[in-house]
Amino acid sequence: ELCDDDPPEIPHATFKAMAYKEGTMLNCECKRGFRRIKSGSLYMLCTGNSSHSSWDNQCQCTSSATRNTTKQVTPQPEEQKERKTTEMQSPMQPVDQASLPGHCREPPPWENEATERIYHFVVGQMVYYQCVQGYRALHRGPAESVCKMTHGKTRWTQPQLICTGEMETSQFPGEEKPQASPEGRPESETSCLVTTTDFQIQTEMAATMETSIFTTEYQ
């Protein structure tokens, strides 16, 4: 039940998991000039029982200077499958990861670890997105993506986060979120259907957009 792909990439945004589902693997990567110790684990694994989850194995890096190389250790081809990269950053606030059953917390850093962590996520994992510094979210709603299994294939849901640059010339300086307009049709509307046709693209999950027209006389 490993997720086949990476979580979606959103321009000018990074994602972070607040907690990791049991079965998640984290590659033991070392920074440039260091390598895994010979007997060291290839990855850490989130495991647990009904009451407690924790990371099995420990990542350990040692100087590779004696090996006459400064190249970062790269995973073998079979390890590269399902690579999920998250930058090391301060965790985001929205979820309390301490009390989520069946999940592990963010593993503590190990000495000389690489600047990016490569996770192998499992079905049901949720990641949260936020705009990088210098960008703001156009919409203040939740921005998350979940790895789901549908028709025997895994896919990540698409987070609807738009990060727009904080430019001096922006048309929306310090803009407030507008009031949500009332849903449903205005009572005054009289619907006079003029045209309705389908526009459909066949994909794995077909999406259809159809447009039609309503007219009312303007008093």
Epitope: P8, E9, I10, P11, H12, L138, H139, R140, G141, T157, Q158, Q160, I162, T164, G165, E166, M167, T169, S170, Q171, F172, K177, P178, A180, S181, E183, F199, Q200, I201, M205, A206, A207, T208, M209
Partner: antibody, heavy 104, light 110 residues
């Protein structure tokens, strides 16, 4: 001078969780972005060129977005497209368009 | 005036390779992905190139995109008569907080 409301119905995906954009194409001309709406909570953004000229709304219960004029002008004659905002801010699925003709 | 600049027309003979350019600025192409849309006569635009160079499924590999600094280009190799259409570049503009389009390029297959 008349009012007009055109609609865009989405299906085959979670309508309320994807932004919908509206695009104008005047006869023989190019594409112009008008605005967008997040149907989940009707959060709306307009292009400065269209702010105050049109109203964008949505009814997520029937998976439909709307573009509305309170007083049409001859210069509003154009083809209007709705499109779903997909991966990386692409407009990935487009409606077939509604031709609005304003004649005096 | 469109924010992105495209040549109004381009042409080529079947089998040829043609390139369409798209020029922008630092608040749009300089900071965001470029998308290319194909609009066949009498139809709605269709996403042709995503994220500068990615082809959505179903788009032939004859179409390719690239981006450099504040400009982008669409290349069509092995030109075919069915490629005759209008092509638009588009991107998000951080100053506008919305999409901007090129004026469109009408491609004629001679």
């Amino acid at each position: 001078g008349e009012s007009l409301k055109i609609s865009c119905k989405g299906s085959g995906y979670s309508f309320s969780t994807y932004w919908i954009g509206w695009v104008r194409q005047m006869p023989g001309k190019g594409l112009e972005w008008m605005g967008l709406i997040y149907p989940g909570d009707s959060d709306t953004r307009y292009s400065p060129s269209f702010q105050g000229q049109v109203t964008i709304s949505a009814d997520k219960s029937i998976s439909t977005a709307y573009l509305q004029w309170s007083s049409l002008k001859a210069s509003d004659t154009a083809m209007y497209y709705c499109a779903r905002v997909g991966d990386g801010y692409s407009l990935d699925y487009w409606g077939q368009g509604t031709l609005v003709t304003v004649s005096s | 005036q469109p924010v992105l600049t495209q040549p109004p027309s381009a042409s080529g003979t079947p089998g040829q390779r043609v390139t369409i350019s798209c020029s922008g600025g630092s608040s749009n192409i300089g900071r965001n992905y470029v998308y290319w849309y194909q609009q066949l006569p009498g139809t709605a635009p269709n996403l042709l190139i995503s994220r500068n160079h990615q082809r959505p499924s179903g788009v032939p590999d004859r179409f390719s995109g690239s981006r450099s600094d504040t400009s982008a280009s669409l290349a069509i190799s092995g030109l075919r008569s069915e490629d005759e259409a209008d092509y638009y570049c588009a991107t998000w503009d951080d100053a506008l907080s919305g999409w901007v389009f090129g004026g469109g390029t009408k491609l004629t297959v001679l």
